[in-house]
């Protein structure tokens, strides 16, 4: 059968029918339904939601919808022994305590099972000591403290502001600095946009609002007790002492009213410069300890959370492909939330729900996609991407042979300014072409394409007339698919104006105030941005699953490989003498990139010209496209990060959220001037260059003519 026969209607008409079926009103209704009570991973409420979604996806018309369960390590506060932080006087009396819960939003006062703010996977402990303010607790912040200011954090409790980097990296840095505890807080400078009111009167963070979140350093491992393997009934589980990525010191998050009380008494060294000062009415002294009259007072943490193996549930829906049922396009997003999940994740889950409904309508009219589409509602994303990772571990053999693409669907909005896309270079052209066909929802761009408004508001730094597309990092459910398995991946959402809004994430992220009303009143009253995101995500899935030739352009990979090679070469060239001394050369890497570029160009010509009616040839060319991303996987993984196996991209070692290019070389070069054995350090740089060179060359050869 030809593709058009199998799908009953012409491909163009299919896509239009699919997009036209998506309705803002439905997304709004689904969001409301998903946000009335908390859906914390591992709770009965979230299991019930899984069953509801299973039932509705079946009604929508999917071929099958299954729940898959795993027993993974989760973490919860002790219900009878709350976590808090005290200022204690010389007699040990508590003279100030941080709050035990957030003041609930209006209308939600009687909701039960709102988990109080906590840092998931914090060990128990009651450390006591002087406070040291460490800014954002980034690598460079600790360099400034330890190397420039000669401040020793050993035995101290550090207080760090949220923002800039993933909280798990902050905790890891504090541990390495010798801290005995970590206090994380939201500074108004990062979480209170000027000229906007606090919730419930606006979208800013109130002083009592607190960001929850896990503080793991899993590096892609999934369940900390079963790295590499699914956490099923017969899984071997490590002991807690051997678990992957757990923090070793107590950690607790607070809001800025509590932070005010802790920071206002700080003494010791002044902050090094204005980049260390937030916007609280405090001096932002670094410490250690309190000033003058208060110097005998100390800070004490009281952390009693417990980690326990708990059952989680993914929902996996299947829409079988008519022509290539053994090729999978996956649309996945998580279902579990910290509290109500008004934005994270339910603004994404509601979009997925509507996409499933639209595909289901087409199927009921006799249509099927060319390839199989899998829909996933992941559990326990907030606890370390556990649901998606365990499922991928369980199905890794199928996925690495059959996985065409993964589209992520967490929060649909983090603002309402313009589109934000992170994806593999293979998907650049797909995204550009799709957004040219979609209408912009932005004010002032009526009748214009999404591509046009996106390009105007978020221009590419390299190519004029094109929009910015960023590298994939981590911190979301695409991680296992892209970084471990090498399946082409992408994500899209509506975002804020990064030029004018300096806050990190949206202010109410992971707080009790992330409600349906937040979205409906302040972010997207007409749900037009949600609809646009549904069209982008759904449109990408549609094209990936239904186009005769996979909508991947390998030439775009060639372009970025050259850019990344230039970038890493320039970093290395900051040490010209050492490069000479240790005979470090990037010639081989540039040669491999050149080869890749030439082979990709020839492949694209063949792709344009081959006989698309020949099913064997078609499958062969599509397989070369599908397996190109896979070719960038090194089975040995990155140094000390075995589950980050992509040689071109990995989450930054200093910020899980950010993507780093040529991460093996980058990490080998990082802070190399401080290494005790320069010969060994530069040897490792050379080893990483050779791995990158081999991988790029090997990937290029997968695009060569097969015989």
């Amino acid at each position: 059968k030809s593709s058009s026969e199998a799908t009953n209607i012409t491909p163009k008409h299919n896509m239009k029918a699919f997009l036209d079926e998506l309705k803002a009103e439905n997304i709004k209704k689904f969001l409301h339904n998903f946000t009335q009570i908390p859906h914390l991973a591992g709770t009965e409420q979230n299991f019930q939601l899984a069953k509801q979604i299973q039932s509705q996806w079946k009604e929508f018309g999917l071929d099958s919808v299954e729940l898959t369960h795993y027993d993974v390590l989760l973490s919860y506060p002790n219900k009878t022994h709350p976590n808090y932080i005290s200022i204690i006087n010389e007699d040990g009396n508590e003279i100030f305590n941080t709050s035990l819960f957030e003041p609930p939003p209006a209308g939600y006062e009687n909701v039960s099972d709102i988990v109080p703010p906590f840092s998931a996977f914090s060990p128990q402990g009651m450390p006591e000591g002087d406070l040291v303010y460490v800014n954002y607790a980034r690598t460079e912040d600790f360099f400034k403290l330890e190397r420039d200011m000669k401040i020793n954090c050993s035995g101290k409790i550090v207080i760090a502001r949220y923002g800039k980097v993933f909280r798990g990296n902050k905790v890891k840095n504090a541990q390495l600095a010798g801290a005995t505890g970590v206090i994380l807080y939201s500074d108004p400078d990062d979480y209170f946009a000027p000229g906007v009111k606090s919730y419930p009167d606006g979208w800013n963070l109130p002083g009592g609002g607190v960001q929850r979140g896990n503080i793991l350093n899993l590096n892609g491992a999934g369940d900390p007790l079963t790295p590499g393997y699914p956490a099923n009934e017969y899984a071997y589980r490590r002991g807690m002492a051997e678990a992957v990525g757990l923090p070793s010191i107590p950690v607790h998050p607070i809001g800025y009213y509590d932070a005010q009380k802790l920071l206002e008494k700080m003494g010791g060294s002044a902050s090094p410069d204005s980049s260390w000062r937030g916007s609280l009415k405090v001096p932002y002294n670094v410490g250690p300890g309190f000033t003058g009259n208060f110097s005998t007072q100390k800070v004490k943490m009281h952390i009693h959370s417990t980690s326990e193996v708990t059952r989680i549930y993914n929902v996996i829906g299947t829409l079988r492909g008519a022509v290539e049922p053994d090729r999978y396009v996956i649309l996945g997003g998580h279902r579990d939330s910290w509290v109500f999940g008004g934005i994270d994740p339910q603004s994404g889950a509601a979009v997925v729900h509507e996409i499933v409904r639209s595909f289901g309508m087409l199927k009921k009219e006799g249509w099927r996609p060319r390839r199989t589409i899998l829909f996933a509602s992941w559990d326990a994303e907030e606890f370390g991407l556990l649901g998606s990772t365990e499922w991928a571990e369980e199905n890794s053999r199928l996925l690495q042979e059959r996985g065409v693409a993964y589209i992520n669907a967490d929060s649909s909005i983090e603002g309402n300014y313009t589109l934000r896309v992170d994806c593999t270079p293979l998907m650049y052209s797909l995204v550009y072409n799709l957004t040219k066909e979609l209408e912009s929802p932005d004010e002032g761009f009526e009748g214009k394409s999404l591509y046009e408004s996106w390009t105007k508001k978020s221009p590419s730094p390299e190519f004029s007339g094109m929009p910015r597309i960023s590298k994939l990092g981590s911190g979301n459910d695409f991680e296992v698919f892209f970084q471990r398995l090498g399946i082409a991946s992408g994500r899209a959402r509506y975002t804020k104006n990064w030029e004018t809004n300096k806050f990190s994430s949206y202010p109410l992220y992971h707080s009790v105030y992330e409600t349906y009303e937040l979205v409906e009143k302040f972010y997207d009253p007409m749900f037009k941005y949600h609809l646009t995101v549904a069209q982008v995500r759904g449109g990408m899935v549609f094209e990936l699953a239904n186009s005769v030739v996979l909508p991947f352009d390998c030439r775009d990979y060639a372009v970025v490989l050259r850019k990344y090679a230039d970038k890493i070469y320039n970093i290395s060239m900051k040490h010209p003498q050492e490069m000479k001394t240790y005979s470090v050369s990037f010639d081989s890497l540039f040669s491999a990139v050149k080869n890749f570029t030439e082979i990709a160009s020839k492949f694209s010509e063949r792709l344009r010209d081959f006989d698309k009616s020949n099913p064997i040839l078609l499958r062969m060319m599509n397989d070369q496209l599908m397996f190109l991303e896979r070719a960038f996987i090194d089975p040995l993984g990155l140094p000390d990060r075995p589950f980050y196996r992509h040689v071109i991209y990995a989450p930054s070692s200093h910020n899980k959220y950010a993507g780093e290019s040529f991460p093996g070389i980058y990490d080998a070069l990082f802070d190399i001037e401080s290494k005790v054995d320069p010969s060994q350090a530069w040897g490792e740089v050379k080893r990483q260059i050779s791995i990158a060179t081999f991988t790029v060359q090997a990937a290029a050869e997968t695009l060569s003519e097969v015989a």
Epitope: I95, T98, S99, P103, P104, E109, G207, G208, K261, N293
Partner: antibody, heavy 125, light 111 residues
Framework: EVQLVESGGGVVQPGRSLRLSCAAS????????MHWVRQAPGKGLEWVAV????????YYADSVKGRFTISRDNSKNTLYLQMNSLRAEDTAVYYC??????????????????WGQGTTVTVSS | QSVLTQPPSASGTPGQGVTISCSGS????????VNWFQQLPGTAPKLLIY???QRPSGVPDRFSGSKSGTSASLAISGLQSEDEADYYC???????????FGTGTKVTVLG
């Protein structure tokens, strides 16, 4: 309309106990800190105690420390003052008051914006 | 005794202005915001000024607050007969870990 209504006052002998209540309505009680303030006959205002919205913090005037306990039941929208070992000098009109929000700090460090009409406590033998 | 000191009384004729001072220390006025309360005879106190100089809605702009260092003042311009009342300054005290009221000032409108 925001309203605070105190009750539980009366005449009591020195050394005995009394519990005052303050019923709140017209606002989201669970999100506010709450104070007790008293005024002895013909005297000025004297702050007695404050409790945070979640009871994580309770502060007392030195004159009542160890004898009085402030508490709240958020499910009942009610504030309490348990007064033990009462003395003649505790004779006063007792007001409950809502903590004042100013956006820069926890409300319980900011004083009061809404007051009840008061309940009279007389400690006399 | 109170740690915030106010003059016991102040007076003025209708239309005149009157200023009440409130003297404290670095642990109260010096480091925390000042509030002013008005207590009309036989009634509960009422918030007049918060955060040093902010007026709640419904309070006439004849009332204004200011703060400098460890002292604060309340100014009443265009005195009216209904302004006859007791006025209290107040602030949190970090050393006492408690809220403190001033000694109170009785304002009399003459004539």
């Amino acid at each position: 309309e925001v309203q605070l209504v105190e009750s539980g006052g009366g005449v009591v002998q020195p050394g005995r106990s009394l519990r005052l209540s303050c019923a709140a309505s017209g606002f989201t009680f669970i999100t506010y800190g709450m104070h007790w303030v008293r005024q002895a006959p013909g005297k000025g205002l004297e702050w007695v105690a404050v409790v945070s919205f979640d009871e994580s913090n309770k502060y007392y005037a030195d004159s009542v420390k160890g004898r009085f306990t402030i508490s709240r039941d958020n499910s009942k929208n009610t504030l309490y003052l348990q007064m033990n070992s009462l003395r003649a000098e505790d004779t006063a009109v007792y007001y409950c008051a809502r903590a004042l929000r100013d956006g820069n700090n926890w409300d319980y460090f900011n004083g009061m914006d809404v007051w009840g009409q008061g309940t009279t406590v007389t400690v006399s033998s | 005794q109170s740690v915030l000191t106010q003059p016991p009384s102040a007076s003025g004729t209708p239309g005149q202005g009157v200023t009440i001072s409130c003297s404290g220390s670095s642990s109260n006025i010096g480091s925390n915001t000042v509030n002013w309360f008005q207590q009309l005879p036989g009634t509960a106190p009422k918030l007049l000024i918060y955060s040093d100089n902010q007026r709640p809605s419904g309070v006439p702009d004849r009332f204004s607050g200011s703060k400098s260092g460890t002292s604060a003042s309340l100014a009443i311009s265009g005195l009216q007969s209904e302004d006859e009342a007791d006025y209290y300054c107040a602030a949190w005290d970090d050393s006492l870990n408690g809220y403190v009221f001033g000694t109170g000032t009785k304002v009399t409108v003459l004539g």
